[in-house]
């Protein structure tokens, strides 16, 4: 039950995160005109990854796409690439995770296959989230650098009668959406990976238990060689009768391949 909840919650959180990454990528407000300590203008500028916009005080808004590919800064291209990679990985992760959900039955899909798919989608969500966070952070760093450069320019070359105003840009809403969305996708991915551990069936049998016969101190290992190696008739993960009752807490499983994420 807990595994299903963790997997379901991981899926929902990732879904919200990826929706947020898509929204952030499409948003025009990656950078907005800095209004602090600036002359108040009747025009407000803001820029996105794909176009720049100008909103006049009257409400009239005009947006122009970046119709060049080669003329754009390399950093902007890198941010675009990171965001697109994040969206693509996230979308594939969502598709995979839908089939991996424990609550959804698809034919005779085994738990081991679902566990693998859950792990795959989890990793994809983690990478997707990291791509989004990296993309937004690169853009934010670019803004900070440009902000201080333009601030320095504002206070130089003012000896003449005519002053020029440099438009400075600061963090736009899309950056915060991107950071939050990337974080959610990352958290969702981690949750999927955690859920995967619970979904993974035991690949080894229960640990051998010592039985003490009256008057003797003989250790009895049920299942013999087969039980300890996993070869032979027990490869299908059937539980071998161990001849003794035990509580759930006493059952110890060896680490499976899904434990190291």
């Amino acid at each position: 039950m807990a595994v299903t909840a963790c997997q379901g919650l991981g899926f929902v959180v990732s879904l919200i995160g990826i929706a947020g990454i898509i929204a952030a990528t499409c948003m025009d407000q990656w950078s907005t005109q800095d209004l602090y300590n600036n002359p108040v203008t009747a025009v407000f500028n803001y820029q996105g990854l794909w176009r720049s916009c100008v909103r006049e005080s009257s409400g009239f808004t005009e947006c122009r796409g970046y119709f060049t590919l080669l003329g754009l800064p390399a950093m902007l291209q890198a941010v675009r690439a990171l965001m697109i990679v994040g969206i693509v990985l996230g979308a594939i992760g969502l598709l995979v995770s839908i089939f991996a959900l424990k609550c959804i039955r698809i034919g005779s899909m085994e738990d081991s296959a679902k566990a693998n798919m859950t792990l795959t989608s989890g990793i994809m969500f983690i990478v997707s989230g990291l791509c989004a966070i990296a993309g937004v952070s690169v853009f934010a760093n670019m803004l900070v650098t440009n902000f201080w450069m333009s601030t320095a320019n504002m206070y130089t070359g003012m000896g003449g009668m005519v002053q020029t105003v440099q438009t400075r840009y600061t963090f736009g809403a899309a950056l915060f959406v991107g950071w939050v969305a990337g974080g959610l996708t990352l958290i969702g991915g981690v949750m999927m990976c955690i859920a995967c551990r619970g979904l993974a069936p035991e690949e080894t049998n229960y640990k051998a238990v010592s039985y003490h016969a009256s008057g003797h101190s003989v250790a009895y290992k049920p299942g013999g060689f087969k039980a300890s190696t996993g070869f032979g008739s027990n490869t299908k993960n059937k539980k071998i009768y161990d001849g003794g009752a035990r509580t759930e807490d006493e059952v110890q499983s060896y680490p499976s391949k899904h434990d190291y994420v």
């Epitope: 203008t41 500028n45 820029q47 006049e56 005080s57 409400g59 105003v165």
Partner: antibody
Framework: QVQLVESGGGVVQPGRSLRLSCAAS????????VHWVRQAPGKGLEWVAV???????NYNSALMSRFTISRDNSKNTLYLQMNSLRAEDTAVYYC????????????WGQGTMVTVSS | DIVMTQSPDSLAVSLGERATINCKSS????????????LTWYQQKPGQPPKLLIY???TGESGVPDRFSGSGSGTDFTLTISSLQAEDVAVYYC?????????FGGGTKLEIK
């Protein structure tokens, strides 16, 4: 069609207050911004204030402390409250609609004369 | 505040001739975001309110005759009347439509020679 009609002007003593009105028709004050511009006799135009469609306001820094722009959306009427009037406030006061493009003023009223004199 | 300086203060031009009015702002009116200059030109005839002629420094308002044109960028702007007509006798004002407070130039009185 778009029409702006100013009223409330007249002769007033220095230090007194006056409220000008601008009745707008043919458009809504919640869709377009409206400016107040004044012109002293034989002088040039002086921008006074604006109230934008969203309700935000901007003023001429020299007049900001004494003048207040407001509107009544239900009456589609704009107001200019003028306090502590001085002789130099004597002028024709125009209200003008903000154009949708370029921040220009595309429709003007005929103006109302305000004379500040003792 | 932005200072708008118009020149000349008055201008006399013969009918059919070209009239040129200049306007200079103390700061650039060019918006980097859309590469538009937020300068507006108005015409005011005696006893009438001003009339919008040109916005964005060079875009003519609808209904304004083609003989009126605007040019310039940054801080220096020009209003040109290609062929002066009798009805063009008026005072012409430029306006900063970029920075608050919006400011007008002192005006240029255009007369017929």
């Amino acid at each position: 069609q778009v029409q702006l009609v100013e009223s409330g002007g007249g002769v007033v003593q220095p230090g007194r207050s006056l409220r000008l009105s601008c009745a707008a028709s043919g458009f809504s004050l919640t869709t377009y911004g409206v400016h107040w511009v004044r012109q002293a006799p034989g002088k040039g135009l002086e921008w006074v204030a604006v109230i934008w469609a969203g309700g935000s306001t901007n003023y001429n820094s020299a007049l900001m402390s004494r003048f207040t722009i407001s509107r009544d959306n239900s009456k589609n009427t704009l107001y200019l409250q003028m306090n502590s009037l001085r002789a130099e406030d004597t002028a024709v006061y125009y209200c003008a609609r903000a154009a949708y493009y370029g921040n220009g003023l595309d429709y003007w009223g005929q103006g109302t004369m305000v004379t500040v004199s003792s | 505040d932005i200072v708008m300086t118009q020149s000349p203060d008055s201008l006399a031009v013969s009918l059919g001739e070209r009239a040129t009015i200049n306007c200079k702002s103390s700061q650039t009116l060019l918006n980097s975001g859309n590469q538009k200059n937020y300068l507006t030109w108005y015409q005011q005839k005696p006893g009438q309110p001003p009339k919008l002629l040109i916005y964005w420094a060079s875009t003519g308002e609808s209904g304004v005759p083609d003989r009126f044109s605007g040019s310039g960028s940054g801080t220096d702007f020009t209003l040109t009347i290609s062929s002066l007509q009798a009805e063009d006798v008026a005072v012409y004002y430029c306006q900063n439509a970029y920075f608050y407070p919006f400011t007008f130039g002192g005006g240029t009185k255009l007369e017929i020679k």
